[in-house]
Interface confidence: low
């Protein structure tokens, strides 16, 4: 059974503003920001299925249920692409498809869904409790990622259990929704500040963060956005990931991939690109990328192939045909 990930109920933001402005005054802007950020959010679904004929082979199907146009799809395993996951395939609607072992066949299914067959042999073969993730970069929604895996007790031919909720990665320039909401939030907060100008100016405190997190960004809308991005996330099992990235990502492929930076081709991630903050819900995971770094005045690290991936405008290879129909 394939389950399409639903955006979960959002937890309230952690206290980030302390000082003269009272708690009640801050509730409304947080609520407004939270509601606006999540209004009309798209969905990503992931289906992982073991082939009955080859018990060590998997088929991963992913789809995007947003209204925007997809600019890139990245499939990874071992967790989200920017959080320890290893890229298996990258699909571009015009430039074509690039895949790395053990990916056998990555294909477009429709304009908004893809599938990937994984070959199960050798050190880089998947196993039943591997987590597979699909990230859809879309304009104007931004990047959305969802993950799924087979339960260890799955019979061959069965599909994955319900997919974990999608991980929002607001990392595309011009994400109109979030930008607009944040702008509105800023204006509203300024309005509140003006109303309270006779009081002492608020001290902006960094939110409580885990030791692994990048330094907290003392900016209220950023924290509000992080609050809106809190989503449950399944524990990542990495025991079945390939021993080395070189074996998983052999070089070669169409000419338009030739100029792909080595680090991006091997592992498009940057450790500082994913913020991990404590969340009341058990096993929660939050990821925030370029959009919020930009707000904090930081330039995010290059975390994926999206920026420099397609230097050849001609795209010498047409996109491969899809596998299956949704």
């Amino acid at each position: 059974m394939r389950t399409e990930a639903q955006v979960p109920a959002l937890q309230p933001p952690e206290p980030g503003l302390e000082g003269a402005m009272g708690h009640r005054t801050l509730v409304l802007p947080w609520v407004l920001l939270t509601l606006c950020v999540t209004a009309g959010t798209p969905e990503v679904w992931v289906q992982v299925r073991m082939e009955a004929t080859e018990l060590s082979s998997f088929t991963i199907r992913c789809g995007f249920l947003g209204s925007g146009s997809i600019s890139l799809v990245t499939v990874s395993w071992g967790g989200p692409n920017g959080a320890g996951g290893t890229t298996l395939a990258v699909l571009h609607p015009e430039r074509g498809i690039r895949q790395w072992a053990p990916a056998r066949q990555a294909r477009w299914e429709t304009q908004s869904s893809i599938s990937l067959i994984l070959e199960g042999s050798g050190a880089s073969s998947p196993c039943a409790n591997t987590t597979f993730c699909c990230k859809f970069a879309s304009f104007p929604e931004g990047s959305w990622e969802a993950c799924g895996s087979l339960p260890p007790s799955s019979d061959p031919g069965l599909s994955a259990p319900p997919t974990p909720a999608p991980i929002l990665r607001a990392d595309l320039a011009g994400i109109l929704g979030v930008s607009g909401v944040l702008l509105f939030g800023c204006v509203y907060l300024l309005h509140l500040l003006r109303r309270h100008k006779h009081r002492p100016a608020p001290r902006l405190q960094p939110s409580r963060t885990s030791p692994q997190a990048p330094r907290a960004r003392a900016w209220a809308p950023s924290q509000a956005s992080q609050a809106a991005l809190h989503v449950p996330y399944a524990t990542i099992n990495t025991s079945c990931r390939p021993a080395t990235l070189d074996t998983a990502h052999p070089h070669g492929g169409p000419s338009w991939w030739a100029s792909l930076p080595t680090h991006a081709a091997h592992r498009p991630q940057g450790p500082a690109a994913w913020a991990s903050t404590p969340i009341p819900a058990r096993g929660s995971f939050v990821s925030v990328e370029n959009g919020l770094y930009a707000q904090a005045g930081e330039r995010p690290p290059h975390t994926g192939p999206g920026l420099t991936l397609f230097p050849d405008p001609r795209g010498p290879r047409a996109m491969e045909g899809p596998l299956g129909v949704r």
């Epitope: 059974m1 394939r2 399409e4 294909r107 429709t110 045909g321 899809p322 596998l323 129909v325 949704r326």
Partner: antibody, heavy 119, light 107 residues
């Protein structure tokens, strides 16, 4: 083995509604896939009408959007086609189908049911 | 909508011949093009998926090729039981669309 069987009146009067049922055996319609209605006109032209997904989401052919509704009864493992304001142009053989490819590339279709729109 | 144009509309061949049926899409369907055979008073049967992928249970004399907007179904050494109408179908984007069909007649 998955089987689909269409049923419904073979004759419908113009301006009335056409209602067909597809009964599925061998697989739960809430488990997966998209459950489609396709029709074939007397001249053999085939037209995809729309589908209802396992989760209840629907997708219709824009040419029929104002007249078509696809629903389901999960307890009976059936899904339904309703086409409103029919004309003689809607006379066709109506198929229900899973346009889904499993690992052998198999596609399941019903046997089809002929519906004639006539006064 | 993506328009699929099949040619020829009808084809009459003798057993043993090799025939090619064409399907042209109004825009790129990225090989999400599927071929069906329909015999009289029967439901369509899938012959080829994704332009060139063979289907288990379908004779190997049926082969598909093509990419972009132009696709071909070839039948090597036609047999009498191959008589019927052949349709191409694109499932790349909704609304899904079928070609008008090529009727294959065996002399």
């Amino acid at each position: 083995d998955v089987q689909l069987q269409e049923s419904g009146p073979g004759l419908v009067k113009p301006s009335q509604s056409l209602s067909l049922t597809c009964t599925v055996t061998g697989y739960s319609i809430t488990s997966d896939y998209a459950w489609n209605w396709i029709r074939q006109f007397p001249g053999n032209r085939l037209e995809w009408m729309g589908y209802i997904r396992y989760n209840g989401n629907t997708n219709y052919n824009p040419s029929l959007k104002s007249r078509i509704s696809i629903t389901r009864d999960t307890s009976k493992n059936q899904f339904f086609l309703q086409l409103n304001s029919v004309t003689t142009e809607d006379t066709a053989t109506y198929y229900c189908a899973i346009i889904y490819y499993d690992y052998d590339g198999f596609v399941y279709w019903g046997q089809g049911t002929l519906v004639t729109v006539s006064a | 909508d993506i328009l699929l144009t099949q040619s020829p509309a009808t084809l009459s061949v003798t057993p043993g011949e090799t025939v090619s049926l064409s399907c042209r899409a109004s825009q790129n369907v990225y090989e999400n093009l599927h071929w069906y055979q329909q015999k009289s008073h029967r439901s369509p049967r899938l012959l080829i998926k994704f332009a060139s992928d063979s289907i288990s249970g379908i004779p190997s004399r049926f082969t598909g090729s093509g990419s972009g907007t132009d696709y071909t179904l070839s039948i090597n050494s036609v047999k009498p039981e191959d008589e019927g109408i052949y349709y191409c179908l694109q499932l790349y984007s909704t609304p899904y669309t079928f070609g008008g069909g090529t009727e294959l007649e065996i002399k």
